[in-house]
Interface confidence: low
Amino acid sequence: DPVLCFTQYEESSGKCKGLLGGGVSVEDCCLNTAFAYQKRSGGLCQPCRSPRWSLWSTWAPCSVTCSEGSQLRYRRCVGWNGQCSGKVAPGTLEWQLQACEDQQCCPEMGGWSGWGPWEPCSVTCSKGTRTRRRACNHPAPKCGGHCPGQAQESEACDTQQVCPTHGAWATWGPWTPCSASCHGGPHEPKETRSRKCSAPEPSQKPPGKPCPGLAYEQRRCTGLPPCPVAGGWGPWGPVSPCPVTCGLGQTMEQRTCNHPVPQHGGPFCAGDATRTHICNTAVPCPVDGEWDSWGEWSPCIRRNMKSISCQEIPGQQSRGRTCRGRKFDGHRCAGQQQDIRHCYSIQHCPLKGSWSEWSTWGLCMPPCGPNPTRARQRLCTPLLPKYPPTVSMVEGQGEKNVTFWGRPLPRCEELQGQKLVVEEKRPCLHVPACKDPEEEEL
């Protein structure tokens, strides 16, 4: 027969969970032993695993509520395709019966004593009620039993006395105007109202009670705007750390306008929110080294040769510079301390020369003295030999530029009776006076 097939069996409740579908055979459903099945909806759920006894059910209620009875519990053989221990088929119930006793004895009714005397009337004036009582002790009930009927009865009574009129309050009067126009000031604003003990007034004869409580009440006014609060400075904060690691710096203290914070249009604190101080690390700041200007080039020489002057023989020369001013662990100068180049020496070499064009006019000299003049020159300029501009000194190191070095002895045709320099001078015109600009401002 077809069954409903489920994907889970819940051991604790014995219920099928996760409906897969119906219309399948038990054999097909139970191809997966984790599955479970029901023969009809709401029927007994059987797991597909091999049969074993379920947990025992809880004990059923005791068969009687008092004295000794008995109670049952059961377990079921659940599973498929096999038997539980004792060769029992799936679906079979096994029962256990035990004695039980919810309450040792059963209740027994009791009997009433006679009625007691009437109590005084419940009021001291006009009409009221009075009560009398009886006891359930003739005999007393047993094992939680009781007596039938009521333990007390009441009837009307009349004191033959006129009652006094007690005072009662009339309705409250209106609230008085508020005692202030804003809240949060030195005095909390209040409004007041009063009432009369006249609804009714207490009687004189017999005397009635006065009205309880107060004839007036006060409350805080609501809906008022808050009073303005002027701001006040909080304390100065800690001094900030000195922001520098050397030399002088500036530290700062801050305070906040929060003692109290200005509120509701009250004025802000007067004065400054910060103040500064000089801080001294007492540590000199590092000074980085700086290169001096390059020194003069050394004479152009070639190792193992006495002189290479006036010859097409490249040599080498160097110049140096000094890293000065470095103090207090400042950076050293970057770059090379020594500069080396290749050179041809033309020191004191007699070379053919040619006259240069006129130089530009020089500065007026003396600048602040009498009759300053300016000058320009034409120079006897040497014509340098046509030696190769680059050489390869060491194989595999490529070509190196070669520079002419030295002061040659140029020879030119005489010009205006001169062999090396021709100079022309002119006076400078409309010369202003030299004045200290600082003194001019005064």
């Epitope: 470095r326 207090f328 662990d329 950076h331 050293r332 770059g335 090379q336 301390q337």
Partner: antibody
Framework: KPSQSLSLTCSVT?????????WNWIRQFPGNKLEWMGY???????KYNPSLKNRISITRDTSKNRFFLKLNSVTTEDTATYYC?????????????WGQGTLVTVSA | DIVLTQSPASQSASLGESVTITCLAS??????LAWYQQKPGKSPQLLIY???SLADGVPSRFSGSGSGTKFSFKISSLQAEDFVSYYC?????????FGGGTKLEIK
């Protein structure tokens, strides 16, 4: 022993420690790694390796022409050979002059 | 701190051969680099300063080159006494630091 202080002295001959040299301490760990520890200059200024935090102090005695190393709170990690060395820092800051070294072993 | 990475950590060579050791700086240091030799049980000895200059009394078979971040140290014709350890050191900014060292071993 661990947690104790280590103290070493370097005596200089043939040159006044108040002239332009800088007087250094360098140590060499058992694996041969070299570490510069710090110096005291001819004018008494100190410079220390930040890795030694506040444990190191280099001082001098100009009357006896010697300088000192003190290393506090030592651990077994401070086991090394300790060298003193001199350099002409302003003109040629290379460690041209070295002491012979002292092996210091820290153990419980 | 400036880190100097020296390579190789050890090298085998034969007498009369040439060897080159490299020292790489983690940032540019100009030519502020020195090379030291250390014999077993002895203190280091200055060989090369300013990357290329030979210290007083050092044989000319030792030479240095490079600037910025890459430096080389060369021994052109190995003698028996050269099979020891060599270290580079920067003096560009404190803390002054050393390379890890190179140990020369005889083949």
């Amino acid at each position: 022993k661990p947690s104790q202080s280590l103290s070493l002295t370097c005596s200089v001959t043939g040159y006044s420690i108040t002239s332009t040299y800088y007087w250094n301490w360098i140590r060499q760990f058992p694996g041969n790694k070299l570490e510069w520890m710090g110096y005291i200059s001819y004018d008494g200024t100190n410079k220390y390796n930040p890795s030694l935090k506040n444990r190191i102090s280099i001082t001098r005695d100009t009357s006896k022409n010697r300088f000192f190393l003190k290393l506090n709170s030592v651990t077994t990690e401070d086991t090394a050979t300790y060298y003193c060395a001199g350099d002409d820092y302003d003109r040629s800051p290379w460690f041209a002059y070295w002491g012979q070294g002292t092996l210091v072993t820290v153990s419980a | 701190d400036i880190v100097l990475t020296q390579s190789p950590a050890s090298q085998s060579a034969s007498l009369g051969e040439s060897v080159t050791i490299t020292c790489l700086a983690s940032q540019t240091i100009g030519t502020w680099l020195a090379w030291y030799q250390q014999k077993p049980g002895k203190s280091p000895q200055l060989l090369i300063y300013a990357a290329t200059s030979l210290a007083d009394g050092v044989p000319s078979r030792f030479s240095g080159s490079g600037s910025g971040t890459k430096f080389s140290f060369k021994i052109s014709s190995l003698q028996a006494e050269d099979f020891v350890s060599y270290y580079c050191q920067q003096l560009y900014s404190t803390p002054w630091t050393f390379g890890g060292g190179t140990k020369l071993e005889i083949k």
